[in-house]
Interface confidence: low
Amino acid sequence: KNNVPRLKLSYKEMLESNNVITFNGLANSSSYHTFLLDEERSRLYVGAKDHIFSFDLVNIKDFQKIVWPVSYTRRDECKWAGKDILKECANFIKVLKAYNQTHLYACGTGAFHPICTYIEIGHHPEDNIFKLENSHFENGRGKSPYDPKLLTASLLIDGELYSGTAADFMGRDFAIFRTLGHHHPIRTEQHDSRWLNDPKFISAHLISESDNPEDDKVYFFFRENAIDGEHSGKATHARIGQICKNDFGGHRSLVNKWTTFLKARLICSVPGPNGIDTHFDELQDVFLMNFKDPKNPVVYGVFTTSSNIFKGSAVCMYSMSDVRRVFLGPYAHRDGPNYQWVPYQGRVPYPRPGTCPSKTFGGFDSTKDLPDDVITFARSHPAMYNPVFPMNNRPIVIKTDVNYQFTQIVVDRVDAEDGQYDVMFIGTDVGTVLKVVSIPKETWYDLEEVLLEEMTVFREPTAISAMELSTKQQQLYIGSTAGVAQLPLHRCDIYGKACAECCLARDPYCAWDGSACSRYFPTAKRRTRRQDIRNGDPLTHCSD
């Protein structure tokens, strides 16, 4: 019953009801994939092919643009290397991050010659500055991939750029890097499939471990090929990887390599017939819901199946306490290639590999001071044996009977009359957005999903590749190869002209105000607002 959306709006209906604003791209650009939301300045920065845009959050029709192509020489070199002049021999922007109060940091593929630079945006929004620092270009190797088809995950904090990307022309040397800043660049171990095995990077996030910033960790989400012995046949595993922010590599071994890198498998599956689980292993996107405690965000992951025969998508939720428990559990160990993976049962050296050097957890001030046995162990045991299971051990959203797959997710926490609800906006590979609310049943972690809306946001079916949500503007911004779309988070008036219809919608954004279905705001005048998200019961709430 919950698989049928309360509202299903075509692109035409979205336009006619003024519920979508689209930027249909420039003739000489495409690939509007790299988003950076700046709520303070009320701008959405978008990296695309040969361009960087600055859209007004109020209305994306109002925008500024920077043209940043490659030189003719560079383009010709790319063409001579056998690459496609339109699809590959251009500057596809892959990294777009806030560098400081006045500048952004941007990197592009540079026609298979990665390049980075700084973009001046001024001190204040009213400065209206948006320009390329032409005098300051940097080598983009280890920051942006060479190949525009490859995914990159990046995070810029304290002047240091963390990137998960491919560092070579061939797109084989995948690594997690830390560049910029005053320290020597650091990366994952090279040519060791136990560390990374043909990964596809999704996103990177800084999460505090304690009140001591020395314990801060950077988490990377990615999917990769399962190593032989983990699975029979070719398989993909979804992963979460951790790195200590204060990791400066080893002294004698793992010099300028991470010493605290660990990874664990993310499971998102449903029990199937014959006791065989159906796994959603292809991680597509991740959203971190920070609420109250920044140390413990809820992780929302969008997954699809690997199978070509059975197409399905799911959303799974993970708690950081479960993630940390896995990283404190047994390491994965095997006695050689093609051997079975087992939980490591030998002596684990002290301090435990993966622990950040800090005063919180004991004696070592720097990773360079770590004993040799810790480094050696870390080098050879990057994976944890136990996987991270989702909250409630199952997905909160599953779609298997449709002709599309999920690609992106953003989540908004909404105050309603009867509590707080997480509303998910899920992008698909056919250019639609699903609006789903998860409603607690008996316990808060036992959730019911209600599909509120299914909206087509692009004229032609095109995969949604980027999404950002502005709580300030109450708007959703969507990117694809074709362009950028903007839509409000709620369309309460469309639910109908009666209290019962509004109540049955179970949309946390909306309530019956006595005369119309409109945006719900928690106010003192509670009795005048009719809303029931948990049960959607109009009899109780609309009878008078």
């Epitope: 006695d335 049962q345 002596r347 050879s380």
Partner: antibody, heavy 120, light 111 residues
Framework: EVQLLESGGGLVQPGGSLRLSCAAS????????MSWVRQAPGKGLEWVSA???????YYADSVKGRFTISRDNSKNTLYLQMNSLRAEDTAVYYC??????????????WGQGTLVTVSS | QSVLTQPPSASGTPGQRVTISCSGS????????VNWYQQLPGTAPKLLIY???LRPSGVPDRFSGSKSGTSASLAISGLQSEDEADYYC????????????FGGGTKLTVL
């Protein structure tokens, strides 16, 4: 102190059988993968067989179907049962422990070896 | 014929630096770590270098390992007479199920 002591070698006729043993001491035997490596007279090292901590077994093509590796964790002993022996199996047979930190193939301790001679 | 290729012999005078090469393929050295063993005359092999470039405790820092692509090398600096031995490189081979492959060995002579 880690010690590996092989025994059971000797002279055997082609087609015959022999069982090698390797007594381990000074470490938790059950936590380590073990291997047999051989060295023909005047020749280089050749990996023969391995057994993982979980009991999974691996063999070189040259001995597959003829040799059987096993372990008895209660006795801290590794075995190699060699059947249908050939002249080319003549070698010094070493038992070796795989280093538990590297998760790879570094044999950090070796026995002194036992000589197997296959001749009529 | 060994899967990993080493020169059959090498030599040097005391104090000299000697390098022994080990060449493989993408399925062994190219995708797995390399180990080196020293076998003194009449004794069992001894682990000299593991994980491409790490020395077990007790191995002098005159011995160093390195790897690039599908080749590895062992360098011995400040050669001493007691270094006269056979040296073997080894690696897993992913194309063989669970195999460790060894080089043919290099006989090092200290002149």
């Amino acid at each position: 102190e880690v010690q590996l002591l092989e025994s059971g070698g000797g002279l055997v006729q082609p087609g015959g059988s022999l069982r090698l043993s390797c007594a381990a001491s000074g470490f938790t035997f059950s936590s380590y993968a073990m291997s047999w490596v051989r060295q023909a007279p005047g020749k280089g090292l050749e990996w023969v067989s391995a057994i993982g901590t979980g009991g999974d077994t691996y063999y070189a093509d040259s001995v597959k179907g003829r040799f059987t590796i096993s372990r008895d964790n209660s006795k801290n002993t590794l075995y190699l049962q060699m059947n249908s022996l050939r002249a080319e199996d003549t070698a010094v047979y070493y038992c070796a422990r795989r280093d538990d930190y590297t998760s790879r193939d570094a044999f950090d301790y070796w026995g002194q070896g036992t000589l197997v001679t296959v001749s009529s | 014929q060994s899967v990993l290729t080493q020169p059959p012999s090498a030599s040097g005078t005391p104090g000299q630096r000697v390098t022994i090469s080990c060449s493989g393929s993408s399925s062994n050295i190219g995708s797995n770590t390399v180990n080196w063993y020293q076998q003194l005359p009449g004794t069992a092999p001894k682990l000299l270098i593991y994980y491409d470039d790490l020395r077990p405790s007790g191995v002098p820092d005159r011995f160093s390992g390195s790897k690039s692509g599908t080749s590895a090398s062992l360098a011995i600096s400040g050669l001493q007479s007691e270094d006269e031995a056979d040296y073997y490189c080894a690696a897993w081979d992913d194309s063989l199920n669970g195999y460790v492959v060894f080089g043919g060995g290099t006989k090092l002579t200290v002149l």
